[in-house]
């Protein structure tokens, strides 16, 4: 509950938040897990902590971890972790499941699109928007405060949305980057790309050792009946029947629940008897269907003792 | 600051038009929102006219209500009252450059509009 | 258009007590933080008090606390002063169409 997976690319900026919340006037350690290592907070340092910010300034490949956040206040503190993930910059325009954000949906009115962690950011508008990496134009478009605005929002509307903008620090600017995908709505059956609504991306199960684990991959694929959409678990980029893990095996949820009218599928994936070497382990969730494929990571990690009182 | 005037007793049907003056800030740097609050009930969002002067309209509000604006204010047109549109009307402020649409920071003292025949 | 379900009212609080107030969304907020907090007394226009979700309001006392994300929220008043009785509403704004929706209000009375 108390970690929070981050990501972002290289030469950009990415800022991030200790997913513990506190007071202002709390003070707010940052200390790099692997090393135990403090965090400097002098602005001149390229990483440095501001209350209960990170600031990577740019960020660096190298930079990836997991950070921990302590908030301190006088009666207690708490403990959050920050997993960070810095990408190398694509060549080409397609962005991968890991770089995206979370999903929106629009309908026929007008729609917005909000520029995914832009309140971490000082930055001034106004935004640059992308559709499928090409600059939006046209009067439909119109980039206001930290969103994008189509009206008339139409099917082919549907699609990845870039948003660019400058993080303004100390007088330096670093650009950032965020992609999200965006949905439309509408009356008439129709299929889309597969979403992927759990796990979360690069999403961290913490579980016990000796118990039992349940993950369930969970994704839609449009509207009315789909002529060919499926949900799978893959260990290591195997198939869980050529595993052959016995205690890992994997059973459909509901087949084809229509929540707001969305087709969508579930697959569980149980594992018995959890063992240290299931933590080592890479989980895909794998979604697809006439549009292709998108897959979400998981990985296992063992359950921290409970926050105490200090 | 922000101002509302033009609140009266009208008769249903009868078009009304409120005027919401500002003074300390740019209508080219915010976006301005109606509100209003019936007696003894809670608020209830109208609509907006934005930096850009797009408009935009709660869905029950659409057809009811124009919202337009010059320079130094911001007009509220009730285009046939009724009964229901008793109510005090307020005019805010949303925070420049802030990345939402929900935070009013600036809010005038409201103006009572009274339908009835 | 999305409905957000406020705590009931009234609800009491002891001066120096702490109060919540939740607010449900029945869709996710725009970017899971368009939310914001308000207070109003008889007779005068609201005051905002947090906004994107956790954010305190300039000159707002410390003692308000806004937290949550995506559909559920809430507003914590601790240390609660007898100047703090009023309704609250939430207010949220939307990624589909350009709807805003303020929550039904929470009374809370302080005694």
């Known amino acids: 509950k108390f970690s929070k997976q981050s990501w972002g690319l290289e030469n950009e900026a990415l800022i991030v938040r200790c997913p513990r919340q506190g007071k202002p006037s709390y003070t707010v350690d940052w200390y790099y897990s692997q090393t135990n290592k403090s965090i400097p907070t002098q602005e001149r340092n390229r990483v440095f902590a501001s209350g209960q910010l990170l600031k990577f300034l740019p960020a660096a490949v190298a930079d990836s971890g997991i950070y921990t956040c302590i908030v301190r206040s006088p009666t207690f503190n708490r403990t959050g972790y920050a997993n960070v993930t810095i990408y190398k910059k694509q060549s080409d325009c397609n962005v991968p499941d890991y770089l995206m954000y979370s999903t929106v949906s629009g309908s026929e009115k007008n729609s917005k699109i909000y520029c995914p962690t832009i309140d971490l950011y000082n930055w001034t508008a106004p935004l640059e928007w992308f559709k499928n990496c090409q600059a939006l134009q046209g009067s439909r478009y119109r980039a206001h405060k930290s969103f994008l605005v189509i009206d008339n929002v139409m099917t082919e509307d549907a699609g990845d949305y870039t948003c660019k903008f400058i993080h303004n620090e100390n007088g330096a600017n670093y650009s950032v980057t965020a992609t999200r995908s965006f949905t439309v709505k509408d009356e008439q059956g129709f299929s889309l790309f597969p979403v992927i609504g759990a796990p979360a991306q690069n999403e961290i199960k913490e579980v016990e050792i000796g118990k039992n684990a349940n993950l369930t991959c969970s994704a839609c694929f449009g509207k009315g009946t789909q002529f060919l959409a499926a949900v799978l678990w893959q260990l290591n980029g195997t198939k869980i029947t050529d595993f052959g893990e016995p205690r890992i095996q994997q059973e459909e949820g509901q087949n084809q629940s229509f929540s707001n009218g969305l087709a969508c599928l579930d697959m569980v994936l149980r594992i018995a008897d959890v063992k240290e070497e299931d933590l080592l382990l890479q989980y895909d969730c794998l979604a697809l269907n006439l549009h292709g494929l998108r897959r979400h990571t998981v990985r296992l990690s063992r359950k921290n003792p409970i926050d105490h009182h200090s | 600051s922000v101002e509302e005037s033009g609140g009266r007793l009208v008769t249903p049907g009868t078009p009304l038009t409120l005027t919401c003056t500002v003074s300390?800030?740019?209508?080219?740097?915010?976006?301005m929102s109606w509100v209003r609050q019936a007696p003894g009930k809670g608020l209830e969002w109208i609509g907006y006219i934005w930096s850009d002067d797009n408009t935009y309209y709660a869905s029950w509000a659409k057809g009811r209500f124009t919202i337009s604006k010059t320079s130094t204010t911001v007009d509220l047109k009730i285009t046939s009252p009724t009964t229901e549109d008793t109510a005090t009307y307020f005019c805010?402020?949303?925070?420049?450059?802030?990345?939402?649409?929900?935070?009013?920071?600036?809010w005038g003292p409201g103006t009572l509009v009274t339908v009835s025949s | 258009a999305a409905v957000l379900t406020q705590t009931p009212s009234p609800v009491s609080a002891a001066v120096g007590g702490t109060v919540t107030i939740s607010c449900q969304s029945s869709?996710?907020?725009?970017?899971?933080?368009?939310l914001a907090w308000y207070q109003q007394k008889p007779g005068q226009p609201p005051k905002i008090l947090i906004y994107k979700a956790s954010t305190l309001a300039s000159g707002v006392p410390s003692r308000f606390e806004g937290s949550g994300s995506g559909t559920q929220f809430t507003l914590t008043i601790s240390d609660v002063q007898c100047d703090d009785a009023a309704t609250y509403y939430c207010l949220g704004g939307y990624d589909d169409d350009a709807d805003n929706t303020f929550g039904g209000g929470t009374e809370v009375v302080v005694k």
């Open positions: 300390g800030f740019s209508l080219s740097s915010h976006d």
């Open positions: 869709q996710s907020v725009g970017n899971n933080n368009d």
């Open positions: 805010a402020r949303d925070q420049y450059r802030s990345s939402g649409v929900s935070d009013y920071d600036i």
